[in-house]
Each structure stands twice: as structure tokens, then as C-alpha cells.
């Protein structure tokens, strides 16, 4: 950056280099350059030279004023016009951000997705700080009273093998940057209850032609918890409401869910799981789109009716969707 | 038949502190969670806290410095504790079960309390 | 806290009339919003989950609709084992939040 440069001089920003954006913040140069009394001295950001808001204060000392600064970063140099030279003299250059402290962290939320080995925790960091802000993730046991803490930039992922002080813990956030720091409020976990199921995934769609047409949507997952409900939800995709259907689950084989739908639409189909009766869920699986048939024209000749019935007409869907919904809608 | 029945002191003074315990049937505690929710003419029904089909708990963040729930699967039992209680905790208190999803399909009939000295 | 608003807080109708009762969320709550009918002297009985899904056990005349911010509950014919109040729920964020009811009056 512009901090590595050979300075003939130097460049400070008051209060500070980092400082809370929408501050007025002052930039000072001081020339210190062999045989020369800057007739000039010349302040530039970004590579454009400022024009107003210049201070000489003395012979080698100039002042750049800035009134409510909202750029998150900068690069400001200064040059010097020294008499019997051509071209301006660098002094030096400092990079300069501005941002906000952090947030106190809040919605701290740790689960173990099962086969990943992980406890995952997550929080709302709150509002962008546009500055480095680190995050130290606090994990003490209840049992031994042992605490470890895990420094991330986001998200932290803690290896179950490394929870060795029982199955209860308080976790807690703390957040900090140069302009400030702030705590979480701790968070009471037990590994037992925060274990999400591996993923449902609705595989293939079919839907049968009978009297009244009847669509089967196939899901399954791959977990071994024997306790799970899941919920899926669907709607036409020209629609806004949600209808969800609630299931309790053994996935010892693929799971068959049957809605009578209206023919010639488009429907919309998602899933999700959790162990019987704990707080978090899974997010909402990909979403899963499915065609239904028009309807099958009334035929008075039996025979056709009947050879139609037992052609079992059926129009099958696989999954084409790849968005992912987040799991806070129903809090998850 | 799903059925749970909340038992309370009825009066309780000023300061002191609030047990109720809620007795279900027809269910399993280790398959359904089990949360209480107060309601009094002032402030109408608000949701106090939660303990899951786990032992995990959450508590609304207004009552979180007073309030314990606790639960013996064996029993049927689910124990609410709420410690310096107020005229303004008046109020009838019904334990309720959800099945993860965050609505209430079965609730008690309620225990009604009284914080008066 | 995400603020439950219900309207009007008293309706007073006639065995027969249909009605529509309204909750308004401060805040985008998709469609986790939930309905529930409270008779006097009695504990809240659930009605309507996700703002449109019914109950098994209760009765069709009640529907539910409604999504993001704006949802209603609708009695078709109400008969006179309806009256009392009617309070709304949403499941979106914690803390669980209830509106402040409804009440179902006869005329």
C-alpha cells in the first residue's frame, strides 16, 4: 500500500488513522526534504489532488480539513513544489478507513449438522463496520469450567472432538475493532439437543392420473436419528402463501407425500427436518419445481376410460432448483 | 387424550418467588417442547420461555434474569420458576406443547395468580 | 420484538353474518403467523397455523389467509358457539408475540 513509500517527511490524520465515519478529520503534512522550503505543499487522495480546505500552518507544515468523511478507505499522499524543481516531491502517504465499532453481537446460535464433525456457530453481526473486525468465540464448559476461544473473521466452525468437558457449555461472542468492542449475551447449549438431521432432499416428483389426479413427491435423508419431523412446504409458483404439511419420519426408506393439486400449474415444493421437539431446523431444502398434468379430457367410450386408467399416465419431475432458503422463517 | 395441567400457589407476596408445575399425558416430554405463556387484562397473553423436548430452554429476554424452567421426563413433569415477583406478574399462567414448530396445539387450562401481600 | 396489531378489538355481530378479523406484524413475518379462538373462562384452542392451514377438529366455516405483514382470519356463518376472542400469533422471530385480541361479540 501507500504506507510502504520512502518518506521525505510525514502525514498524520487526527484523531486517528482509523476513525468513526462521518467524523471531521484533519490530515497533516510536514515536509522534510534536503534543500528545499516547499513553496507548495500538496495534499492528494486517491490519486486526485485536493483543492479546498488547505491550511498552511507553517513553512513545512500543511493541513487537509474534511467535513463528515464517509469513504470507508483512502489513500492520501502529499507532495512539496520545491523551488528549482520540475516536477512536485513526495513527502508521504498514509491509508486512512473509517467505519463503526461493532455491534454487540446477538441471535448466537451453535448446532452440530450430523456427519460434519462440526459445532457451528453463527450470529448477527449487525451492521457493517467497514473496517477489520474480528470476532472471539468464547466455549466454556459447565462441567469443568474449562473455556476455550476460537478467533474468526465470521462464522466459527469447532470440532466436536475438541468439546471435551461434557455436553453443556456457555458460548458467547465478543466482537472488536479499533473503534470498539462489544459482548454477546451467553448462550446455554447442550450438545444432545442442537444436532440437525442430515439434509431431506426432495428427489423426484410424479403425478398419477385417477379419478381425482394425486401428485406423490419423494424425499429422503440420510440420517440415523430416529426421532425426526420434518415439514413440507409448497405453493404454486404464482403464488405468495406458503401451505406446509407436517410429518413424523422414519427414513429407513424413502418417504411418499401425496397432495391432490390443481392440474396445469406449476407448484413449488421445499422441505425441512429436525429432531423430534428441539428448537433449530434444518434451512429449507433447494427448491423442487413440479408441473402438474393438464387434465385428461372426459371420454364417454368406457373402453378409452378404461385403457386410460390402466395406463397409469404419469408426469414425473426432477429437481432443477439450487436456491436455498435460509431457516429463520419459523425462527429454525 | 393429550392433556396438561398446571398447579399453582394461587397468592403469592410481593418479592417472592413463583413455582408451577405442569403435569402432561398423551405425550411424551422427550418428543414435544413445552413453553408458558401468562395472560392478565393489562398485557395481554406473552410468551414466557420454553423447554424443549432436549433440556435446552429459551426464555424471553425480558423475563431471562428471573425465570427457570426445568423438567423430569420420567414424571411427566415440566417445573416453571420465577423468582421477585410484582403486583404486574398477576396473571393466569398456562404451560402449552408445540412440536417444534413454533405454535401451540394443546394447552393447560391455566392456574390463575394473585402477587398481593 | 416483532409488534402483533389486531383490529378491530371488538366486533359485534348477528348468528349468521360472516366476518373477517385482521393482524398486522411490525415487520415481514412470511406466513408464520398463527390463530387462536379463547371462549370465556377457557384456555386458547389453536384455530389456524401458518396463517391458512387448518386444524383437524375444527370446524370449516374458519379460514385463515394472509402474508408478510397483513393476514385475516375469516368465519363464514358464525354461529353462536364463536363468540369470544380471537388472538393472532407470530412464530417469525423470538420472542414469541401474541396480538391483543379480538373480541367476537353478539349483537
Known amino acids: 500500500g501507500i504506507t510502504n513509500i520512502n518518506c521525505s517527511g510525514h502525514i498524520w490524520v487526527e484523531p486517528a488513522t482509523i476513525f468513526k465515519m462521518g467524523m471531521n478529520i484533519s490530515i497533516y503534512c510536514q515536509a522534510a526534504i534536503k534543500n528545499c522550503q516547499p513553496r507548495k505543499l500538496h495534499f492528494y487522495k486517491n490519486g486526485i489532488k485536493e483543492r479546498f480546505q488547505i491550511t498552511r500552518i507553517n513553512k513545512t507544515t500543511a493541513r487537509l480539513w474534511y467535513k463528515n468523511f464517509l469513504e470507508p478507505h483512502a489513500s492520501m499522499y502529499c507532495t512539496a513544489e520545491c523551488p528549482k524543481h520540475f516536477q512536485e516531491t513526495l513527502i508521504c502517504g498514509k491509508d486512512i478507513s473509517s467505519g463503526y465499532p461493532p455491534d454487540i453481537p446477538d441471535e448466537v446460535t451453535c448446532v452440530i449438522y450430523e456427519y460434519s464433525g462440526n459445532m457451528t456457530c453463527t450470529w448477527n453481526a449487525g451492521k457493517l463496520t467497514y473496517i477489520d473486525t474480528k470476532y472471539v468465540v468464547h466455549v466454556k464448559s459447565l462441567e469443568t469450567e474449562e473455556e476455550q476461544q476460537y478467533l474468526t473473521s465470521s462464522y466459527i466452525n469447532i470440532s466436536t472432538d475438541s468439546l471435551q468437558g461434557g455436553k453443556k457449555y456457555l458460548v458467547w461472542v465478543q466482537a472488536a475493532n479499533a473503534l470498539g468492542m462489544e459482548e454477546s449475551k451467553q448462550l446455554q447449549i447442550h450438545l444432545d439437543d442442537i444436532v440437525i438431521p442430515s439434509a431431506a432432499v426432495i428427489s423426484r416428483a410424479e403425478t398419477i392420473n385417477a379419478t381425482v389426479p394425486k401428485t406423490i413427491i419423494y424425499w429422503d435423508s440420510q440420517t440415523t436419528i430416529e426421532k425426526v419431523s420434518c415439514e413440507m412446504r409448497y405453493k404454486a409458483t404464482t403464488n405468495q402463501t406458503w401451505n406446509v404439511k407436517e410429518f413424523d419420519t422414519n427414513f429407513t426408506y424413502v418417504q411418499q407425500s401425496e397432495f391432490y393439486l390443481e392440474p396445469n400449474i406449476k407448484y413449488v415444493f421445499q422441505v425441512r427436518c429436525q429432531e423430534t421437539g428441539k428448537r433449530y431446523w434444518q434451512p429449507w431444502s433447494s427448491l423442487f419445481f413440479h408441473k402438474t398434468p393438464e387434465t385428461v379430457p372426459q371420454v364417454t367410450s368406457k373402453a378409452f376410460q378404461h385403457d386410460t386408467w390402466n395406463s397409469g399416465l404419469t408426469v414425473a419431475s426432477i429437481s432443477t432448483g439450487h436456491l436455498t432458503s435460509d431457516n429463520r422463517g419459523d425462527i429454525g | 387424550q393429550v392433556q396438561l395441567k398446571e398447579s399453582g400457589p394461587g397468592l403469592v407476596q410481593p418479592s417472592q418467588s413463583l413455582s408451577i408445575t405442569c403435569t402432561v399425558s398423551g405425550f411424551s416430554l422427550t418428543s414435544y417442547g413445552v413453553h408458558w405463556v401468562r395472560q392478565s387484562p393489562g398485557k395481554g397473553l406473552e410468551w414466557l420461555g420454553v423447554?424443549?423436548?432436549?433440556?435446552?430452554?429459551d426464555y424471553n429476554a425480558a423475563f431471562i434474569s428471573r425465570l427457570s424452567i426445568s423438567k423430569d421426563n420420567s414424571k411427566s413433569q415440566v417445573f416453571f420458576k420465577m423468582n421477585s415477583l410484582q403486583a404486574d406478574d398477576t396473571a393466569i399462567y398456562y404451560c402449552a406443547r408445540s412440536r417444534g414448530s413454533y405454535y401451540f396445539d394443546y394447552w393447560g387450562q391455566g392456574t390463575t395468580l394473585t402477587v398481593s401481600s | 420484538d416483532i409488534k402483533m396489531t389486531q383490529s378491530p378489538a371488538t366486533l359485534s355481530v348477528t348468528p349468521g353474518d360472516s366476518v373477517s378479523l385482521f393482524c398486522r406484524a411490525s415487520q415481514s413475518i412470511s406466513n408464520n403467523l398463527h390463530w387462536y379462538q379463547q371462549k370465556s373462562h377457557e384456555s386458547p384452542r389453536l384455530l389456524i397455523k401458518?396463517?391458512?392451514q387448518s386444524i383437524s377438529g375444527i370446524p370449516s366455516r374458519f379460514s385463515g389467509s394472509g402474508s408478510g405483514t397483513d393476514f385475516t382470519l375469516s368465519i363464514n356463518s358464525v354461529e353462536t358457539e364463536d363468540f369470544g376472542m380471537y388472538f393472532c400469533?407470530?412464530?417469525?422471530?423470538?420472542?414469541?408475540?401474541f396480538g391483543g385480541g379480538t373480541k367476537l361479540e353478539i349483537k
Open positions: 423447554i424443549w423436548s432436549g433440556v435446552s430452554t
Open positions: 401458518y396463517a391458512s
Open positions: 400469533q407470530q412464530s417469525n422471530s423470538w420472542p414469541l408475540t
